[in-house]
């Protein structure tokens, strides 16, 4: 008789999840010499230990503590790029501007990027059928708690000028309910962070509006200012040209506004 299994509303664990995490860890530590000391088997053991045999709606930040500790790394605190709803461009940017880092350029972010995972209470099985959806099922699920935990630590580590890339095509350019709006903004440390600089990325070819005047950006400015951090904002009217100019800053067309 097949055992009854909880049906969740979200997709199940990414196939070959253990192998993927382990392979990503090995690849990352090979590419980044400063992380060569990391034992990827231990990293996987800590990752697994955070959610295996636990109810997938009852995960806490503490469950991820061993993983956070084993995966801690040195990132230049003044070279941090946060993003909200515009991950691909942010990653394209840091692939070119190699001295800047998104969360997914760190070991822990790289391991989990685009993956889903969950277990089941009291069994050592990984649930490949379904996992809790943040809205429909519960917020304290393994994936959401992981990203909340690593995002908080990443923001806490930031210093000097912190950059954030925001999607100007969204109805809410700054969304208080995003990971950036609900976690990272509130964990920037005013004693270390001088300025948050927002880059608002325009979607339309002919869009010449000043999206820095958008009400949600003003809301972000208000939140940041109340935390004693300065705020600045730039429109990126042509993201394609922006990337091109990051690659080739000497190009004559790169002196004009992008």
């Amino acid at each position: 008789v097949p055992r009854w299994r909880q049906q969740w509303s979200g997709p199940g664990t990414t196939k070959r999840f253990p192998e993927t995490v382990l392979a990503r860890c090995v690849k990352y530590t090979e590419i980044h010499p400063e992380m060569r000391h990391v034992d990827c088997q231990s990293v996987w053991d800590a990752f697994k230990g955070a959610f295996i045999s636990k109810h997938p709606c009852n995960i806490t930040e503490e469950d991820y503590q061993p993983l956070m500790k084993l995966g801690t790394q040195t990132v230049p605190c003044n070279k941090i790029l946060l993003w909200s709803r515009i991950k691909d461009l942010a990653h394209q940017f840091t692939q070119v501007q190699r001295d800047m880092f998104t969360l997914e350029d760190t070991l822990l972010g790289y391991l989990a990027d685009d993956l889903t995972w969950c277990g089941e209470f009291n069994t050592s099985k990984i649930n490949y059928q379904s996992c809790p959806d943040w809205r429909k099922d519960c917020s304290n699920n393994p994936v959401s708690v992981f990203w909340k935990t690593v995002s908080r630590r990443f923001a806490e580590a930031a210093c000097d000028v912190v950059h954030v890339m925001l999607n100007g095509s969204r109805s809410k350019i700054f969304d208080k309910n995003s990971t950036f709006g609900s976690v990272e903004v509130h964990n920037l440390q005013p004693e270390k962070v001088q300025t948050l600089e927002a880059w608002v990325i325009h979607g339309g070819r002919e869009d010449s509006r000043d999206l820095c005047q958008d009400p949600t950006i003003k809301e972000l400015e208000s939140i940041i200012s109340k935390r004693n951090i300065q705020f600045s904002c730039k429109n990126i009217y042509r993201p394609d040209k922006f990337l091109q100019c990051v690659k080739n800053p000497e190009d004559s067309s790169c002196t004009s506004e992008i």
């Epitope: 231990s42 061993p66 084993l70 790394q73 630590r153």
Partner: antibody, heavy 117, light 107 residues
Framework: QVQLVQSGAEVKKPGSSVKVSCKAS????????IEWVRQAPGQGLEWMGD????????DYNEKFKGRVTITADESTSTAYMELSSLRSEDTAVYYC??????????WGQGTLVTVSS | DIQMTQSPSSLSASVGDRVTITCGAS??????LGWYQQKPGKAPKLLIY???NLHTGVPSRFSGSGSGTDFTLTISSLQPEDFATYYC?????????FGQGTKVEIK
């Protein structure tokens, strides 16, 4: 080889502060956690807190929160543990150790701190 | 805080004996357990990390086992230099906590 060398013994008055140093060598200082543990005379081991020198991450035992500050100087590969508002119960040997797989693989020789009026 | 309970608190044994020390955690700590040896007036030394991994330079007569809440340190054939106090330590959650120690004495 990995070595952690701590500062010398200290005698302190109640209410004062002590700062113990721990100089690391033989490995990349910024890549490993440094743990601080103390041991009162004839007693067991008690974890106080730790630091990841490369990112300045710190975690403290709630029991010592507000009284202990752990810092690190990357330029000299030295970690520091400062304990304030000292009382007689703080008389102990204070150890630093390097973190490895959530255990502590190499230890300093220990620093005896005596709190006495 | 996670409580770590070692037993026995002390034991007397002879050279060549097989010695077993147990350590229990008040909640699941997965494999995040270390074992240390400490001699009077000296700093502790790591013997075993991650419940069963032998630290560099530690003789193979020392072994560790267990996961979850129950762990064991075994010395297969006690040597004169093994008379010391042994501590277990959990690294699953803050604050890290140690067992109260097991003193191994000469019979």
């Amino acid at each position: 080889q990995v070595q952690l060398v701590q500062s010398g013994a200290e005698v302190k008055k109640p209410g004062s502060s002590v700062k113990v140093s721990c100089k690391a060598s033989g490995y990349t200082f910024t890549n490993h956690w440094i743990e601080w543990v103390r041991q009162a005379p004839g007693q067991g081991l008690e974890w106080m807190g730790d630091i990841f020198p490369g990112g300045g991450y710190t975690d403290y035992n709630e029991k010592f929160k507000g009284r202990v500050t752990i810092t690190a100087d990357e330029s000299t590969s030295t970690a520091y543990m400062e304990l304030s508002s000292l009382r007689s119960e703080d008389t102990a040997v204070y150890y630093c150790a390097r973190g490895r797989d959530l255990a502590m693989d190499y230890w300093g020789q220990g620093t005896l701190v005596t709190v006495s009026s | 805080d996670i409580q770590m309970t070692q037993s026995p608190s002390s034991l007397s044994a002879s050279v060549g004996d097989r010695v077993t020390i147990t350590c229990g955690a008040s909640q699941n700590i997965n494999v995040w357990l270390g074992w240390y040896q400490q001699k009077p007036g000296k700093a502790p030394k790591l013997l075993i990390y991650k419940a069963s991994n032998l630290h560099t330079g530690v003789p193979s007569r020392f072994s560790g086992s267990g996961s979850g809440t129950d762990f064991t340190l075994t010395i297969s054939s006690l040597q004169p230099e093994d008379f010391a106090t042994y501590y277990c330590q959990q690294g699953q959650s803050y604050p890290y906590t140690f067992g109260q120690g097991t003193k191994v004495e000469i019979k």
